[in-house]
Interface confidence: medium
């Protein structure tokens, strides 16, 4: 690599013709160690480092901040307070670095942080008030715009005894702090069932990602308010399928569009009503990919092509008739 | 002309403390991260420990956590280590070394070293 | 921790001639940008002197007889000309994580 610093390159050290002329370094701001830094781009990476502290000599002009691939494991209360504030920064990610715990206030004293990435971090503690920063019940609300909590779940050993659906959702309703969040992503996470009043608290969504979870159905969930929302993942969970006032609901949404690839949807006679809405409907995509997966009789066939005919339930016998 | 000279080396009993310095000059001391460097007598280089400009982030070797303690006093110039309950594998000589604001660029001043020997 | 690893351990060279040194790190030290790869060399009785920096570039007041090279994992010290102030151990260091981790050593000596 060259030696010289360019306005768009990474630098982790001063500029070559700085540091053979003389023996100072430009100082402006300095690059913590283990890390690369461009003013120029307002960036700073420490990746894949180690890590198991955030460094606390970040430079006072960081915008975006990767610190990705470290072993962090516990993120404490303040963990980005500096004097003075790193007031720039606005994109954090923290994928990937072994995070267990985040615990009240971690995000404290960013007033610019739109965006922040915990995905693929055990997080077996998640505080309520690691995004509100206070137990108040109406916190000040939080700059974040987007907030990426894909693949957070933790072995299935290291959870606590409750819920993790719960302590995600708690952590996402505390103080309503997240009333201007627009992008939610929670993929991955083996979700069985979103509690119903998660979507109700978070009006500025536009693009909620629940992929790859296993979601059985959404009949106690409400879309109703989110009259922004722009885009809605539901691939690859474990739905059967999606009752009536699910889909109205649905397709009262402006701006819409529903992904439901890869779900279990069982074609029987509690079908008929999202048939007939599947073909009438433009909010889903790809919906000609979608198909039965059960009974075993359908498996495979498409749900566009089905009728009402094809959609039968086995009769429910008497129990003196019924077999084991 | 960039000067680092290491002091306060010397014998120590096995357990007992001795604390080394380092005087700066030459370089504006608070701009740069800190190091020490240790070498065995006949063996190799192993680094020891690292302290940012403004002492505000720490890193040890496991080999010396928890009794070796890195700290400096910008306002003398001096970089300074604590050493505790020290063993017989602790004996070496131990350098004191700049390294720039940015760390891309390794260790571009090193002291002459201090001998430390740990002995009953 | 990344495990420095230097070939060969010693290497007796005629003045004139060329000599290398290879480092091999225990996993990648290097980012898509740079590479965290550095070079010392140790006379008898004084401290290391840095020599290459981030893997090729040439510290100020070095001879330009020393070059260094590679990425990822793989790095080498040329010496083009061997001179005789040139012996002593030279020494690879990473600086990608804590610890900071130096190879072994290698013993240049004139023949």
């Known amino acids: 690599s060259s030696p010289t610093s360019s306005a768009s390159s990474f630098s982790s050290s001063a500029p070559f013709l700085a540091s053979a002329v003389s023996a100072q370094p430009p100082l402006p701001d300095q690059c913590p160690a283990l890390c690369e830094c461009s003013e120029a781009a307002r960036t700073v990476k420490c990746v894949n480092r180690n890590l198991t502290e955030v460094p606390t000599d970040l430079p006072a002009y960081v915008r975006n901040l990767f610190l990705t691939g470290n072993q962090l494991a516990v993120l404490p209360a303040g963990a980005f307070a500096r004097r003075p504030p790193l007031a720039e920064l606005a994109a954090l990610n923290l994928s990937g670095s072994r995070l267990d715990e985040v615990r009240a206030g971690a995000f404290e004293h960013l007033p610019s942080l739109r965006q922040l990435d915990l995905s693929h971090n055990p997080l077996a503690d998640l505080s309520p008030f690691a995004f509100s920063g206070s137990n108040a019940s109406v916190s000040a609300p939080s700059p974040l715009v987007e907030l990426i909590l894909n693949h957070i779940v933790p072995p299935e050993d290291e959870r606590q005894n409750r819920s993790f659906e719960g302590m995600v959702v708690a952590a996402l309703l505390a103080g309503r702090a997240l009333q201007g969040l627009r992008r939610l992503e929670l993929a991955s996470n083996h979700f069985l069932y979103l509690p119903r009043d998660v979507l109700a608290q978070l009006p500025s969504l536009r693009h909620l990602d629940l992929s790859n979870n296993s979601l059985v159905s959404l009949t106690y969930v409400s879309f109703r308010n989110l009259t922004h929302l722009e885009s809605l993942h539901l691939e690859d969970n474990a739905l059967k399928v999606l009752h009536n006032g699910t889909l109205a609901e649905l397709q009262g949404l402006p701006h819409i569009r529903v992904f439901l690839d890869n779900n279990p949807w069982v074609c029987d006679c509690h079908m008929a009503d999202m048939v007939t809405w599947l073909k009438e409907t433009e909010v889903v995509q790809g919906k000609d990919r979608l198909t039965c997966a059960y009974p075993e009789k359908m498996r495979n066939r498409v749900l566009l092509e089905l009728n009402s005919a094809d959609l039968d339930c086995d009769p429910i016998l008497p129990p003196s008739l019924q077999t084991s | 002309e960039v000067q680092l000279v290491e002091s306060g080396g010397g014998v120590v009993q096995p357990g007992r403390s001795l604390r080394l310095s380092c005087a700066a000059s030459?370089?504006?001391?608070?701009?740069?991260?800190m190091h020490w460097v240790r070498q065995a007598p006949g063996k190799g280089l192993e680094w020891v420990a690292y302290?940012?400009?403004?002492?505000?982030?720490?890193y040890y070797a496991d080999s010396v956590k928890g009794r070796f303690t890195i700290s400096r006093d910008n306002s003398k110039n001096t970089l300074y280590l604590q050493m505790n309950s020290l063993r017989a594998e602790d004996t070496a000589v131990y350098f004191c070394?700049?390294?720039?604001?940015?760390?891309?660029?390794?260790?571009?001043?090193w002291g002459q070293g201090t001998t430390v020997t740990v002995s009953s | 921790d990344i495990v420095m690893t230097q070939t060969p351990l010693s290497l007796s060279v005629t003045p004139g001639q060329p000599a290398s040194i290879s480092c091999r790190a225990s996993?990648?030290?290097?980012?898509?940008?740079?590479?965290?790869m550095h070079w010392y060399q140790q006379k008898p009785g004084q401290p290391p002197q840095l020599l290459i920096k981030?893997?090729?570039n040439l510290e100020s007041g070095v001879p330009d007889r020393f070059s260094g090279s590679g990425s990822g994992t793989d790095f080498t010290l040329k010496i083009s000309r061997v001179e005789a102030e040139d012996v002593g151990v030279y020494y690879c260091?990473?600086?990608?994580?804590?610890?900071?981790?130096f190879g072994g050593g290698t013993k240049v000596e004139i023949k």
């Open positions: 070394a700049r390294s720039p604001a940015y760390y891309r660029y390794g260790l571009d001043y």
């Open positions: 030459g370089f504006t001391f608070s701009n740069f991260g």
């Open positions: 302290i940012s400009s403004g002492s505000s982030t720490f």
């Open positions: 996993q990648s030290v290097s980012s898509s940008t740079f590479s965290y």
């Open positions: 981030s893997s090729s």
């Open positions: 260091q990473h600086s990608w994580e804590i610890p900071y981790t």
